[in-house]
């Protein structure tokens, strides 16, 4: 039978560490981390780490009992936790029968937004006390709300992560930029900034209807290639909503005309 893993929390040092071992398995060949979205309840998601590792292909894996993975997170709240994954069988070959290295993965360790994590893994039995213990570590910075996985977190959906404003912005002439976007059902206030090194144009928009809206914004200098920053003010996130960006391009001949005055917004400036 092929070895599989059974993982569980192990907070303190592994018991094997207290025992002298004449021989120990080698280190891991590779360690990788990615994010996975798991359903917790209806419309509730948890974002977890999918940690995968590859064993080094040599006879020392015959001694391998387990692999221990520890994760420390650094943001406003420091965290540290470990799991121990026991191999269910002794390894009878250095590669999988179908070819390739022995590869295992563990899904766990909840992930916070924009946090630096250090993930380290070592094989058990590990080196004796006062000896170098071969371990593999990777740094992983979890992304923010616009990441394709993180955007489903409640914290992110409330900040507007699932809203697609589909911003388009084009330079009508030297003095005017037309910005189009789709409004958000959770709010009706927006600010639009057009920036290069400085702010070239600014507008506040009030729009109650759920629609594609168009705003003409006066600019003070050359706007082609400038960044358009759209900030929504939603009921769920107030002033802390996710900002969206677009780029000003030249308007083409066929670009949609600015709608009649009842739909046009030219506030602020």
């Amino acid at each position: 039978r092929e070895p599989t893993i059974q993982c569980g929390s192990e907070t303190g040092p592994s018991p094997e560490w207290m025992v002298q071992h004449t021989l120990t398995p080698g280190d891991l060949r590779d360690l990788q981390v990615e994010l996975v979205k798991t359903s917790v309840a209806a419309e509730e998601f948890s974002i977890l780490m999918n940690i995968s590792w590859i064993l080094r292909a040599d006879a020392s894996i015959r001694l391998l009992k387990a692999t221990k993975i520890c994760v420390s997170g650094k943001n406003n709240m420091n965290s540290y936790s470990c799991v121990r994954c026991n191999y269910t069988e002794a390894f009878q070959s250095q590669t999988r029968p179908s070819g390739g290295k022995w590869t295992f993965s563990y899904v766990g360790f909840p992930v916070e937004l924009s946090t630096l994590y250090l993930i380290s893994a070592h094989n058990i039995p590990n080196a004796n006390m006062n000896e170098d213990s071969p371990s593999l570590s990777v740094n992983f910075t979890s992304p923010g709300c616009l990441n394709h996985v993180m955007k489903y977190k409640k914290q992110c959906t409330e900040a507007g992560s699932l809203w697609d404003p589909d911003i388009t912005a084009c330079k009508k002439n030297e003095k005017m930029v037309e910005v189009n976007f789709t409004t958000n059902p959770l709010g009706n206030r927006y600010t639009i900034l057009i920036q290069r090194d400085t702010t070239l144009g600014f507008s506040r928009v009030l729009e109650n209807k759920l629609m594609r809206t168009s705003v003409a914004i006066p600019v003070t200098e050359e706007s082609e290639g400038a960044v358009v920053q759209l900030t929504p003010y939603l009921h769920t996130c107030g002033n802390d909503c996710i900002r969206r960006e677009g780029t000003v391009v030249l308007c083409s001949e066929t670009s949609a005309p600015i709608p009649p005055d009842d739909n046009r917004r030219m506030l602020g400036g």
Epitope: S60, S98, G99
Partner: antibody
Amino acid sequence: QVQLQQPGAELVRPGASVKLSCKTSGYTFISYWMNWVKQGPEQGLEWIGRIDPYDSEIQYNQKFKDKAILTVDKSSSAAYMQLISLTSEDSAVYYCARSGGFDWFAYWGQGTLVTVSA
Amino acid sequence: DIQMTQSPASLSVSVGETVTITCRASENINSNLAWYQQKKGKSPQLLVYDVTNLADGVPSRFSGSGSGTQYSLKINSLQSEDFGSYYCQHFWRPPYTFGGGTNLEIK
């Protein structure tokens, strides 16, 4: 049955390179590491290195890391070893040998006699 | 690198005798040891792996033993086809090394 086929001999000039082949059959090529072993005239066996055909991971004996280049061609189930900057010291029989479950060498090719001579 | 020291380097014996070849590793190789036989002009053939396991088709007069750093290959009642060279090899961790060989010749 498992077979590893190697050409019988190669004659090469000093300073030149030679690429030795090891054509395999009778087993799943990507499932076992392929090793290369040198045997000098009237001498013992020296492990040169090994390659995993699955992902082309290579491990060399440090002594040969600037002498041998190991490759595989999965589509034809063949392993290759290129020997570079040849000198008379490189005149030897070179074997390919397939690993077993671990790195005992369960199957060997017939060997290629490389003669380096002007 | 792990050194494999094999002895004796050569042995002259008669058919029907029993011989033992020994191999010492410079460090513990955890029983990851193989033995090979090589006839003149031929490629080596696996005889024994994991110290005691006989490869397919190897006669039962061959047997291996040992642990840690000390290993041996015993051939009971030598047959004429057993003459040739014998090599031990460790496969604990790369780089793998062979013993210097034992040349077994007919007396």
